[in-house]
């Protein structure tokens, strides 16, 4: 069958790294610099992705595989193939449209991207708060006291100083 | 409020030079992740991308115009520039700069635009 | 260089109607594709980047879709401020280019 596909069509032949030079009697040409061809009998090489200004070259391109990028320290990836490259905030913040903003009472984030999420309600779960969450991490819930058996303590935390979740300004 | 606002523009004499101003108010230009880029459009044509240049100081131009292009920028002043030279009857267009990205998203992209400024080359 | 062909060039439309617009790369962009507004005399307005992402305080009736080489702007039901040219541009590689425009004329 190979040998068939090749007598109908010489371009076949041409690897991946190189194209069908209609111009040069179908013989296989090199892909020029900053393009590649990741299949063989390709007619064409296709130009490279190129990582310029906030996007931050991952993978080179080569002959045979296209370049990949990311971005540049303080801002994340987002979209297909890193179409954007999205700010970080620190924990504790979200990304509103007038930059990074603090969680709200009651919300936390553990990363530099997302959203603020709301604290876990333990009591849903029929159990106590164990550990009061904060902006940086959520509420760690313990035991129900109804599990505790006679004479057992529950590891009660010592009572904020301030509202958790916030932070002195 | 972000602004753009290009000046420099006029009549050139062919073989001359011109060198537009844009001044960026309502960000940074040295920001990290902020660019800023120089488009022209010839009269009852598309758009054409002249080169850009980001915070870093990393410039990248249009092959077709490298030679005779130069962007640059002025932090103090918040200003950016546009140098062209050996000018011709087809570089009469108007001039625009413009900012990559959008809010805190960033990428090759243009937001905010100035008003543009007319260069005619004409003897 | 990477060429985009936008189509139709022009088209006459009516208040209300669905308008779709369409741009095809020479080859795949990926997501890497942004779709611009124009009036005369003014600077080109940001609608659509990253393919899809609607740019913040434009309308919800633009729309875009698409990846690889064919693309659409899709207004949803056209209004009398949309009546313009839009041009397609790519920021896959450099230097970064723009189809050729398509106008929008009232019927």
């Known amino acids: 069958f190979e040998r068939t596909r090749s007598l109908q069509d010489p371009c076949s032949n041409c690897p991946a790294g190189t194209f069908c030079d209609n111009n040069r009697n179908q013989i296989c040409s090199p892909c020029p610099p900053n393009s590649f061809s990741s299949a063989g009998g390709q007619r064409t090489c296709d130009i490279c992705r190129q990582c310029k200004g906030v996007f931050r070259t991952r993978k080179e391109c080569s002959s045979t595989s296209n370049a990949e990028c990311d971005c540049t320290p303080g801002f994340h990836c987002l979209g297909a193939g890193c179409s954007m490259c999205e700010q970080d905030c620190k924990q504790g913040q979200e990304l509103t449209k007038k930059g990074c903003k603090d969680c709200c009472f009651g919300t936390f984030n553990d990363q530099k991207r997302g959203i603020c999420r709301p604290w876990t309600n333990c009591s849903l779960d029929g159990k106590s708060v164990l550990v009061n969450g904060t902006k940086e991490r959520d509420v760690v819930c313990g035991p129900s006291p109804a599990d505790l058996s006679p004479g057992a303590s529950s590891v009660t935390p010592p009572a904020p100083a301030r509202e958790p979740g916030h932070s002195p300004q | 409020e972000v602004q753009l606002v290009e000046s420099g523009g006029g009549l050139v004499q062919p073989g001359g030079s011109l060198r537009l101003s844009c001044a960026a108010s309502?960000?940074?230009?040295?920001?990290?992740?902020?660019?800023v880029t120089w488009i022209r459009q010839a009269p009852g044509k598309s758009l054409e991308w002249i080169g850009d240049?980001?915070?870093?100081?990393?410039?990248y131009y249009s092959p077709s115009l490298k030679s005779r292009v130069t962007i640059s920028r002025d932090n103090s002043k918040n200003t950016l520039y546009l140098q062209l030279n050996s000018l011709r009857a087809e570089d009469t267009a108007v001039y625009y700069c413009?900012?990559?990205?959008?809010?805190?998203?960033?990428?090759?992209?243009?937001?905010?635009w100035g008003q543009g400024t007319l260069v005619t080359v004409s003897s | 260089d990477i060429q985009l062909t936008q189509s139709p060039s022009s088209l006459s439309a009516s208040v209300g109607d669905r308008v779709t617009i369409t741009c095809r790369a020479s080859?795949?962009?990926?997501?890497?594709l942004n779709w611009y507004q124009q009036k005369p005399g003014k600077a080109p307005k940001l609608l659509i980047y990253?393919?899809?992402t609607l740019q913040s305080g434009v309308p919800s009736r633009f729309s875009g879709s698409g990846s690889g080489t064919d693309f659409t702007l899709t207004i949803s039901s056209l209004q009398p401020e949309d009546f313009a040219t839009y041009y397609c541009?790519?920021?896959?590689?450099?230097?970064?280019?723009f189809g050729q425009g398509t106008k929008v004329e009232i019927k």
């Open positions: 990253a393919a899809s």
């Open positions: 240049i980001y915070h870093s100081g990393s410039t």
């Open positions: 080859q795949s962009i990926s997501s890497y």
């Open positions: 309502g960000f940074s230009l040295s920001t990290s992740g902020v660019g």
């Open positions: 413009a900012r990559e990205g959008s809010d805190a998203v960033a990428g090759d992209w243009f937001d905010y």
């Open positions: 541009q790519q920021y896959y590689s450099t230097p970064l280019t």
